[in-house]
């Protein structure tokens, strides 16, 4: 699983790339995306 902390501190990533990774994780884990 990819934690929010990891994602928000992943340097050099675009905001869309973070959203992309969140959404891919959401589709698997069904976590709420808001």
């Amino acid at each position: 699983a990819v934690s929010e902390h990891q994602l928000l501190h992943d340097k050099g990533k675009s905001i869309q790339d973070l959203r992309r990774r969140f959404f891919l994780h959401h589709l698997i884990a069904e976590i709420h995306t808001a």
């Epitope: 990819v2 990533k13 675009s14």
Partner: antibody, heavy 118, light 115 residues
Framework: QVQLVESGGGVVQPGRSLRLSCAAS????????MSWVRQAPGKGLEWVAT????????YYPDSVKGRFTISRDNSKNTLYLQMNSLRAEDTAVYYC???????????WGQGTLVTVSS | QLVLTQSPSASASLGASVKLTCTLS???????IEWYQQQPLKPPKYVMD???????STGDGIPDRFSGSSSGADRYLSISNIQPEDEAMYIC?????????????FGGGTKVTVL
């Protein structure tokens, strides 16, 4: 290996309905989001619908919202696309696709052709 | 509006190299995209995802002759030592989530011919 096999395509009149199926094997179906992508004859690809692993979340483009419904039966390892109020512009090969942790459409089926014509 | 632009065609001699371009709409120049290969009469195949910094992850069974790079709003797919089986349509795609809605768009594709 991942296998996705679509079925249910055929010729249908405008305004009628059709349900497509995608039988999945070679992986734990209930662990992944799934999608439908279509390709009109001689044209480009168009994303049609996406559903989360357990079926709780669904997503559609405006072109099909309110007419198409994506669903899944994890006990049968099967993905569905219910298509209502079909139009000529819905004529296409419909592919099902599986996500990975890295990307949306990592694995694709062979496709099933839907022809909407009177 | 999220838009991807691709040249309709490209060609290369057997064993040579070719570099394909997918251009993002200017306000989306930092976006990660995906590349797909579609051989004639076959379904699309995932090739790679490609980030703004040029880093990429390739799909199953993709030879290391395929590589990706980025510059500004341009995302490139390079094929070195091109082979007959590389003759195909190459399509880029990009997704985003906006206000809890998902959107995914594809480019028009570039048809690659091996001479």
């Amino acid at each position: 290996q991942v296998q996705l096999v679509e079925s249910g395509g055929g010729v249908v009149q405008p305004g009628r309905s059709l349900r497509l199926s995608c039988a999945a094997s070679g992986f734990t179906f209930s662990s992944y989001g799934m999608s439908w992508v279509r390709q009109a004859p001689g044209k480009g690809l168009e994303w049609v619908a996406t559903i989360s692993s357990g079926g709780s979340y669904t997503y559609y483009p405006d072109s099909v919202k309110g007419r198409f419904t994506i669903s899944r039966d994890n006990s049968k390892n099967t993905l569905y696309l219910q298509m209502n109020s079909l139009r000529a512009e819905d004529t296409a090969v419909y592919y099902c696709a599986r996500q990975t942790t890295m990307t949306y459409f990592a694995y694709w089926g062979q496709g099933t052709l839907v022809t909407v014509s009177s | 509006q999220l838009v991807l632009t691709q040249s309709p065609s490209a060609s290369a001699s057997l064993g040579a190299s070719v570099k394909l371009t997918c251009t993002l709409s200017s306000q989306h120049s930092t976006y990660t995209i995906e590349w797909y290969q579609q051989q004639p009469l076959k379904p699309p195949k995932y090739v790679m995802d490609l980030k703004q910094d040029g880093s990429h992850s390739t799909g199953d069974g993709i030879p290391d002759r395929f590589s990706g790079s980025s510059s500004g709003a341009d995302r490139y797919l390079s094929i070195s030592n091109i082979q007959p089986e590389d003759e195909a349509m190459y399509i880029c795609g990009v997704g985003d989530t906006i206000k809890e809605q998902f959107v995914y768009v594809f480019g028009g594709g570039t048809k690659v011919t091996v001479l």
